[in-house]
């Protein structure tokens, strides 16, 4: 059956032979209605990429550099299955490119000019493409030929396989630049030996090199890693201090109509029958015809790449930056230490309008990027299409898991002038009901619920976390009869109460009328039995404070809070009747942009923050008529975090633990991708 056939692309006679053997052996173990293999032979991996894009083939396995080519337009391919190495219990699908230095040296990443460098080899990922790509814009002009620019940047190097005649400085530390193990400084171990022997000041290798060459921890402790934020970390902190995370070997397919489920079904079956130590007659990960045919011989198996993970996310911002710099050879005109405009990520139409107004008023220091969901915004910040946004704590957690860092906190209670330097304790997550109802925390089953959005703190993580510990399952849509929790599956009962309008029904943005704090409260007013919001929501939308037709006549005393002990209290008593304390919303950014974002925002709030009294005739950063656009409307200021500058420290151990527990129930495709 053609639609059940996976056309595998082979790039040599030997690969084609192995592919045919793969096809025949799969035929013998799979049912006739299962997936089948067909073989397509092309002259090169690039030809395979083009063939897949043109629907003449379906799949090929590629190294990281070629995954980048495959992702570029017009190919638009995406990773669907990753090879893994190591054990099934601790599968490695990536390695980390690192810059290793001796502990007793005293320079940082931005002080490499004039140092001596050790590389694994010319044109190799960890040893050349990544470090030189990331340093590209610091190289002296002209940057072409690249080898000459690198020779003029470092005071001496060992770059195995470089041309020692044309670029003698690249071979200064290893005369001749030998391109094999005859050169003692060749490849990973060689580059590390070059550093160890004192020939070089820095070695560009992969994270495992140090461990493979120094079994003794005391010896490893003599070395450190250079981080991109111009700090250093110990060699075992490579996940937080690397130049780039590099995928090892990946199966790619078309982004649309790419048969990814079929490819996974095929490879999953293949690894069951012909994986490591599975079969004598055919081995997926070795071949009598040659090395690394179709798949790497060192692979131990396959893992399905999460569907939310596109090539940009898979390759990572640092890797793409490095390769793009090398390929395109373009650098910003502004010096790299100067802050460029900050691209704010706005959610859908209304936030975009506010962001545009901010952009105009900031004289272009703020630029705007849009996305339809918070997770899409986080992904844009990860891949460099945007730089920053302010997030609820639940999304600060997801952003943190995706490598972003908190930069400033929204403060709600501290009056100026101390606001900017005050760390607030957080706000209260509460459950609100109508005073006329007889609901308590203990009889919510079967009732109608209103949530700010799935994944948000007060509207979801805290109440559902508490609920989970009571009911021990994730079927929250069965616990409540119906509800509105924007971001739920469209056919779920937790989208039933949402108001839309239609194409935006249950979408986690302002186009859904019941989205956010005000939206969840409106849902309670108009349809629901309980709303999970922040403690300020009722006072901010009653007594005429919200002029909208649905809210203008509401009275605060018509609503009460549910306490965890089964009692109820006035909305004026959140300190004695709340579900939990929630961390304030916070601005997040990529590490490389964090300082610029902080500096710019502190400057912007001095101009447009809560010191502006007349918002009808001036732009106000923290005002949007109860819509909480870009920032919560009750923000007094954005405050420095001081030492709370990681997501774990910012959110606090208790909240992180609660959200981690709820991950069993996670509906976050982004979180799944970021923890792959």
């Amino acid at each position: 059956v053609p639609e059940k056939s996976v056309r595998w692309c082979a790039v040599s006679e030997h690969e084609a032979t192995k592919c045919q053997s793969f096809r025949d052996h799969m035929k013998s173990v799979l049912p006739s209605n299962g997936p089948s293999v067909a073989c397509v032979k092309k002259a090169s991996h690039l030809d395979c990429i083009r063939a897949i894009a043109a629907n003449e083939a379906d799949a090929v396995t590629l190294d990281a550099g070629l995954v980048y080519d495959a992702y570029l337009a017009p190919n638009n391919l995406k990773p669907v299955v990753a090879e893994f190495y190591g054990s099934k219990e601790d599968p490695q699908t990536f390695y980390y490119a690192v810059a290793v230095v001796k502990k007793d040296s005293d320079f940082q990443m931005n002080q490499l000019r004039g140092r001596k460098s050790c590389h694994t080899g010319l044109g190799r990922s960890a040893g050349w493409n990544i470090p030189i790509g990331l340093l590209y814009c610091d190289l002296p002009e002209p940057r072409k030929p690249l080898e000459k620019a690198v020779a003029n940047f470092f005071s001496g190097s060992c770059v195995p396989c470089a041309d020692g005649t044309d670029f003698p400085q690249l071979c200064q530390l290893c005369p001749g630049c030998g391109c094999s193990t005859l050169n003692q400084y060749f490849s990973y171990s060689g580059a590390f030996k070059c550093l160890k022997d004192g020939a070089g000041d820095v070695a560009f290798v992969k994270h495992s090199t140090i461990f493979e060459n120094l079994a003794n921890k005391a010896d490893r402790d003599q070395y450190e890693l250079l981080c991109l934020d111009n700090t250093r970390k110990s060699v075992d902190e490579y996940k937080d201090c690397h130049l780039a995370r590099v995928p090892s070997h990946t199966v790619v397919a078309r982004s649309v109509g790419g048969k990814e489920d079929l490819i996974w079904e095929l490879l999953n079956q293949a690894q069951e029958h012909f994986g490591k130590d599975k079969s004598k007659e055919f081995q997926l990960f070795s071949s009598p015809h040659g090395k690394d045919l179709l798949f790497k011989d060192s692979a131990h198996g396959f893992l399905k790449v999460p569907p939310r993970m596109d090539a940009k996310m898979y390759l990572g911002y640092e890797y793409i930056t490095a390769i793009r710099n090398l390929r395109e050879g373009t650098c910003p005109e502004a010096p790299t230490d100067e802050c460029k405009p900050v691209k704010w990520c706005a959610l859908s139409h209304h936030e975009r309008l506010k962001c545009d107004e901010w952009s105009v008023n900031s004289a272009g220091k703020i630029e705007c990027e849009s996305a339809e969901t918070t997770e899409d915004c986080i992904a844009k910040i990860m891949n460099g299409e945007a730089d920053a946004m302010s997030l609820d704590g639940g999304f600060v957690y997801i952003a943190g898991m995706c490598g972003l860092v908190p930069v400033l906190a929204e403060n709600y209670n501290t009056p100026n002038p101390n606001c900017e330097n005050t760390a607030e304790e957080g706000y209260f997550a509460v459950a609100v009901v109508k005073s006329s109802s007889d609901l308590t925390w203990d009889n919510l089953k079967g009732k109608k619920s209103c949530h700010t959005a799935v994944g948000r703190t007060a509207g979801w993580n805290i109440p559902m976390g508490l609920l989970y510990s009571k009911i021990n399952h994730c079927r929250f849509d069965e616990f409540f009869s119906e509800g509105c929790a924007p971001g739920s599956e469209k056919n779920s009962s937790l989208c039933k109460l949402c108001m839309g309008p239609s194409p935006n029904l249950c979408e986690p943005n302002n186009k859904e009328g019941y989205y956010g704090y005000t939206g969840a409260f409106r849902c309670l007013v108009e349809k629901g039995d309980v709303a999970f919001v922040k403690h300020q929501t009722v006072p901010q939308n009653t007594g005429g404070k919200n002029p909208d037709a649905w809210a203008k006549n509401l009275k605060e005393e018509d609503y009460e809070l549910l306490c965890l002990d089964g009692s109820r209290k006035s909305v004026q008593e959140p300190a004695n009747c709340h579900l939990a304390r929630a961390p304030n919303h916070a601005v997040v950014a990529r590490k490389d942009k964090a300082d610029c974002v902080q500096t710019l925002l502190l400057d912007q709030q001095r101009m447009f923050g809560s010191s502006v009294t007349d918002c009808s005739s001036n732009f106000c950063l923290f005002e949007s008529k109860t819509k909480d656009l870009l920032f919560r409307d009750d923000t007094v200021c954005l405050a420095k975090l001081h030492d709370r500058n990681t997501y774990e420290k910012y959110l606090g151990e208790e909240y992180v633990k609660a959200v981690t527990n709820l991950r069993k129930c996670s509906t976050s495709p982004l979180l799944e991708a970021c923890t792959f």
Epitope: H350, D356, N361, A363, S617, S624, L629
Partner: nanobody, 117 residues
Amino acid sequence: EVQLVESGGGLVQPGGSLRLSCAASGSIFSIATMAWYRQAPGKGLELVSGITRSGSTNYRDSVKGRFTISRDNSKNTMYLQMNSLRAEDTAVYYCTDYSSRYYHDYWGQGTLVTVSS
């Protein structure tokens, strides 16, 4: 309610010029940040240029040096002078004010600018 009426669009050759006007009724004009947006066929709405009530201006990169935004508060009118027009400037141009604070959208009918030889 605020009413915004755009005019001045038309067909022009590449390299040519046009001046768009936006007349506003309602008392908000002199205090609001105003902006020109455009929407090319099959594309989303994009900010072209904005002007604050104090007269500071901002432009998207692709129109910098070619377009000039201005306002005349006494006439409740905003202008966009477009020079050195290119085919990629073809779009419906809308003016908006932000006085409504993203609360209600006040958009006019727009004025079509076609740049073609």
